[in-house]
Interface confidence: low
C-alpha cells in the first residue's frame, strides 16, 4: 500500500440546520478510475465510520440510501456534505481516500476537519 497526501480544512462550522460541508483533496500519483472516500469521526479517542462511497472518476459519489452524507467530485477534489448534525456530533471528521483501481493501491488519510455544531435556540413564543 502506497501513501498519498490528503488535504482538508482544519475547521468548519455547521449551519443552523445541522449541515456541514468541506472539501477533501488528494494528490493522486496516477490516473485512478475508481476512488473510495470514507469519512471517519474521532471523538474521545474513538474512531467510527460516518459514511463511505465509491465513485468512478468524473462521476457522482454513491452513498447508501440511509447515509447522512452526500458528495460530488471534481478532479482530485471531493465536496462532502454531512447532514443531520447535532451539538453532540461535534468532533474531528477525517477524510480517508483510497485509490482502488487500477493497481497499485494508494491510501491517504487527512488530518481531519473539526466540525462544530451548535444546536439552534428554540424560537420564543410570539404574540401577534
Amino acid at each position: 500500500c502506497k501513501a498519498m497526501h490528503v488535504a482538508q480544512p482544519a475547521v468548519v462550522l455547521a449551519s443552523s440546520r445541522g449541515i456541514a460541508s468541506f472539501v477533501c483533496e488528494y494528490a493522486s500519483p496516477g490516473k485512478a478510475t475508481e476512488v473510495r472516500v470514507t469519512v471517519l469521526r474521532q471523538a474521545d479517542s474513538q474512531v467510527t465510520e460516518v459514511c463511505a462511497a465509491t465513485y468512478m472518476m468524473g462521476n457522482e459519489l454513491t452513498f447508501l440510501d440511509d447515509s447522512i452524507c452526500t458528495g460530488t467530485s471534481s478532479g482530485n477534489q471531493v465536496n462532502l456534505t454531512i447532514q443531520g448534525l447535532r451539538a453532540m456530533d461535534t468532533g474531528l471528521y477525517i477524510c480517508k481516500v483510497e485509490l482502488m483501481y487500477p493497481p497499485p493501491y494508494y491510501l491517504g488519510i487527512g488530518n481531519g476537519t473539526q466540525i462544530y455544531v451548535i444546536d439552534p435556540e428554540p424560537c420564543p413564543d410570539s404574540d401577534f
Epitope: 478510475t33 475508481e34 465510520e49 463511505a52 465509491t54 468512478m56 457522482e60 454513491t62 447508501l64
Partner: antibody, heavy 117, light 107 residues
C-alpha cells in the same frame, strides 16, 4: 422506489446459451454497481459478476469467466447476463442486485435457470 | 482469495432467545462485511453493512460486531419472523464472497 426485475430464465440444454435481463428503476442506474448472484437449489449464495454501467467496468467469478458476459444498456436502465456453454452446475436462481462499494442493498426476485438434457 | 467461514451451519432456537452467528475471514480484511437475511423462495435482504452499521428499516434487535477476523451477527431477542437463513458477505478487491449460510430454525 428502487426496483430490479429479472427475466429470461428457463430450461436449456448443456452447452446451450441464455440471456438474462435485469430491468432497473427508481435510482440512477449508471452510478451503482449491478451484480448477478446465483443460488443453486438448496445451496448458498454465489456471486457471479458485476458491472459499473457508467464506465462499463466488469468483473467475474472464476467459475464463469470466459463463459458469461455481463453488460448494461444505460438508455434502457437494464443489465444483462449472457450465459454461454452452460453446464448442469449452472442450474440456479439468478438474482440481480444493486450494489454500493461493499454491499448489495436491493435485490430482484430472481429468475430460475435450469440446465438439463 | 479470502474465504468467509460461517458457523454454525444451522441452529435451533426459541422465540426470545439471543442468537449469535459468526463469520471468520481466512485472512485480515477491512470492516467491509455485510449480513443478509433470506427466507425460502425470497431474495436476500440487507441487515448490516460495514460490519456494524444497521441498515435502514432493520429492527434494532439485529446488531453486528467485529473482533479481528471474526465478524458476528447477533439477534438480541429472536422473533417469529426471524426464522430464516443468514449470510455474511465481504468484498476483497473485485470479488464479492458470501459465507455458507446459517439456517435459524424453530426449536
Amino acid at each position: 422506489e428502487v426496483q430490479l426485475v429479472e427475466s429470461g430464465g428457463g430450461l436449456v440444454q448443456p452447452g446451450g446459451s441464455l440471456r438474462l435481463s435485469c430491468a432497473a428503476s427508481g435510482f440512477t442506474f449508471s452510478t451503482y454497481y449491478i451484480h448477478w448472484v446465483r443460488q443453486a437449489p438448496g445451496k448458498g449464495l454465489e456471486w457471479v459478476a458485476v458491472i459499473y454501467p457508467y464506465t462499463g467496468f466488469t468483473y467475474y467469478a472464476d467459475s464463469v469467466k470466459g463463459r458469461f458476459t455481463i453488460s448494461a444498456d444505460t438508455s434502457k436502465n437494464t443489465a444483462y447476463l449472457q450465459m454461454n456453454s452452460l453446464r448442469a452446475e449452472d442450474t440456479a436462481v439468478y438474482y440481480c442486485a444493486r450494489g454500493e462499494y461493499t454491499v448489495l442493498d436491493y435485490w430482484g426476485q430472481g429468475t430460475l435457470v435450469t440446465v438439463s438434457s | 482469495d479470502i474465504q468467509m467461514t460461517q458457523s454454525p451451519s444451522s441452529l435451533s432456537a426459541s422465540v426470545g432467545d439471543r442468537v449469535t452467528i459468526t463469520c471468520r475471514a481466512s485472512q485480515s480484511v477491512s470492516s467491509a462485511v455485510a449480513w443478509y437475511q433470506q427466507k425460502p423462495g425470497k431474495a436476500p435482504k440487507l441487515l448490516i453493512y460495514s460490519a456494524s452499521s444497521l441498515y435502514s428499516g432493520v429492527p434494532s434487535r439485529f446488531s453486528g460486531s467485529r473482533s479481528g477476523t471474526d465478524f458476528t451477527l447477533t439477534i438480541s431477542s429472536l422473533q417469529p419472523e426471524d426464522f430464516a437463513t443468514y449470510y455474511c458477505q465481504q468484498r476483497d478487491s473485485y470479488l464479492w464472497t458470501f459465507g455458507q449460510g446459517t439456517k435459524v430454525e424453530i426449536k
